[in-house]
């Protein structure tokens, strides 16, 4: 054996953002021929010996960080990248608006503003079709998301979520969609 066994992949299907009471499947995938998997929920001391975890109805207690490994012979693989499973719909939806407005000229600037009546300190913005949240290096997880020098690629449908840093995997319902039009 030269070097550690390669890490498996861990994914959530259909998405790692799961509305409460909706189903989700966590799947750990290693090399062909591997059948001994361990799927762990971090910070909970628990694990199961299967590659697939089917959750028929998402609960608050199932939100959190997951990781998996596999065993080949007596050797363990490197762990997968952590998967963050988020329960959405735990709190009421925030509102999403665009300043100065949802129609913006190419090359112009726009700021997407996520507002909630709760005292949340964290916000996530998603663009429809993108699996990962919109990340602005300066203002990730803030209430406002400035988009400097808008291009046609920025046009699309956006939604935001709000949550607390104390419970980072329990999110609000998504805001109503906001259509950003680049002219």
């Amino acid at each position: 054996q030269s070097g550690p066994l390669p890490k498996p992949s861990l994914q959530a299907l259909p998405s790692s953002l799961v509305p409460l009471e909706k189903p989700v499947t966590l799947r750990c995938q290693g090399p062909p021929g591997v059948d001994l998997y361990r799927l762990e929920k971090l910070s909970s001391s628990r694990y199961q010996d299967q590659a697939v975890l089917f959750i028929p109805a998402m609960k608050r207690s199932l939100a959190g960080r997951y990781r998996c490994s596999y065993q080949n012979g007596s050797l363990w693989s490197l762990p997968s990248d952590q998967l963050e499973l988020v329960a959405t719909g735990v709190f009421a939806k925030p509102s999403l608006s665009a300043q100065p407005g949802p129609a913006v000229s190419s090359g112009g600037d726009v700021t997407l503003q996520c507002q909630t009546r709760y005292g949340f300190d964290q916000f996530a913005l998603y663009k429809e079709g993108d699996p990962a949240p919109y990340k602005n290096p300066e203002r990730w997880y803030r209430a406002s998301f400035p988009i400097i020098t808008v291009t046609a690629a920025h046009s699309g449908t956006y939604r935001c979520y709000s949550f607390s840093s104390r419970d980072p995997y329990l999110w609000s319902a998504p805001s109503d969609p906001l259509e950003l039009v680049v002219t």
Epitope: L36, R38, E40, S43, R46, Y47, D49
Partner: antibody, heavy 123, light 112 residues
Framework: QVQLVESGGGLVKPGGSLRLSCAAS????????MSWIRQAPGKGLEWVSS????????DYAASVKGRFTISRDNAKNSLYLQMNSLRAEDTAVYYC????????????????WGQGTLVTVSS | QSVLTQPPSVSGAPGQRVTISCTGS?????????VHWYQQLPGTAPKLLIY???NRPSGVPDRFSGSKSGTSASLAITGLQAEDEADYYC???????????FGGGTKLTVLG
């Protein structure tokens, strides 16, 4: 109530072999991970080996790998530890311990322990 | 040499509060694994005292509490009683080879 009773300990010469057994009762044995944990005289606890509920997942401490073999017989509600090539430093009380389980999840801690069986390796 | 580090001994007078620390690394406690604590009274097998960093099994008095932060954890005992005199062990899991790891143990002496 949950009971774990170890047996098979005794005096053995260096290089010799011994087989420990742990008889489990009062719970569904086949649902739980099980481990052997040892404690040298006057020293702390050292995890030795664990086996998954179906006997597929097996792990050993580096200090015993290649010399000790853990196994289980779910039909007999029994856990075993075959110890070969014994050394003086293997002298210890050997405990059988159950891992907590809830629904489909196993947990990384031990909720019940046996009273232990003493293994002495000496010439 | 234990993977998790505990002080060899602590002591306190009856009624006092004592804490026992448990320090690990980024491959065990810092890798998202919880810390569990066991009490071993003289001449007996270990008994689960705290699981999942801060949870008490039924029957364990609320004088015992646990916490975890980063790569370390601690066990606090308030209102010390003579029957608390025992060895205390922390335990976690290590990601490297999926092994269970213990601290070296701490002997608690109740003075007087």
């Amino acid at each position: 109530q949950v009971q774990l009773v170890e047996s098979g300990g005794g005096l053995v010469k260096p290089g010799g072999s011994l087989r420990l057994s742990c008889a489990a009762s009062g719970f569904s044995f086949s649902d739980h991970y099980m481990s052997w944990i040892r404690q040298a005289p006057g020293k702390g606890l050292e995890w030795v080996s664990s086996v998954g509920s179906e006997g597929k997942f097996i792990d050993y401490a580096a200090s015993v790998k290649g010399r000790f073999t853990i196994s289980r017989d779910n039909a007999k509600n029994s856990l075993y530890l075959q110890m070969n090539s014994l050394r003086a430093e293997d002298t210890a009380v050997y405990y059988c311990a159950r891992h907590y389980r809830e629904f489909r999840w196993h947990y990384y801690y031990f909720d019940y322990w046996g009273q232990g069986t003493l293994v002495t390796v000496s010439s | 040499q234990s993977v998790l580090t505990q002080p060899p001994s602590v002591s306190g007078a009856p009624g006092q509060r004592v804490t026992i620390s448990c320090t690990g690394s980024s491959s065990n406690i810092g890798a998202g694994y919880d810390v569990h604590w066991y009490q071993q009274l003289p001449g007996t097998a270990p008994k689960l005292l705290i699981y999942g960093n801060s949870n008490r099994p039924s029957g364990v008095p609320d004088r015992f509490s646990g916490s975890k932060s980063g790569t370390s954890a601690s066990l606090a005992i308030t209102g010390l009683q003579a029957e608390d005199e025992a060895d205390y062990y922390c335990q976690s899991h290590d990601l490297g080879a999926h092994v269970w790891v213990f601290g070296g143990g701490t002997k608690l002496t109740v003075l007087g």
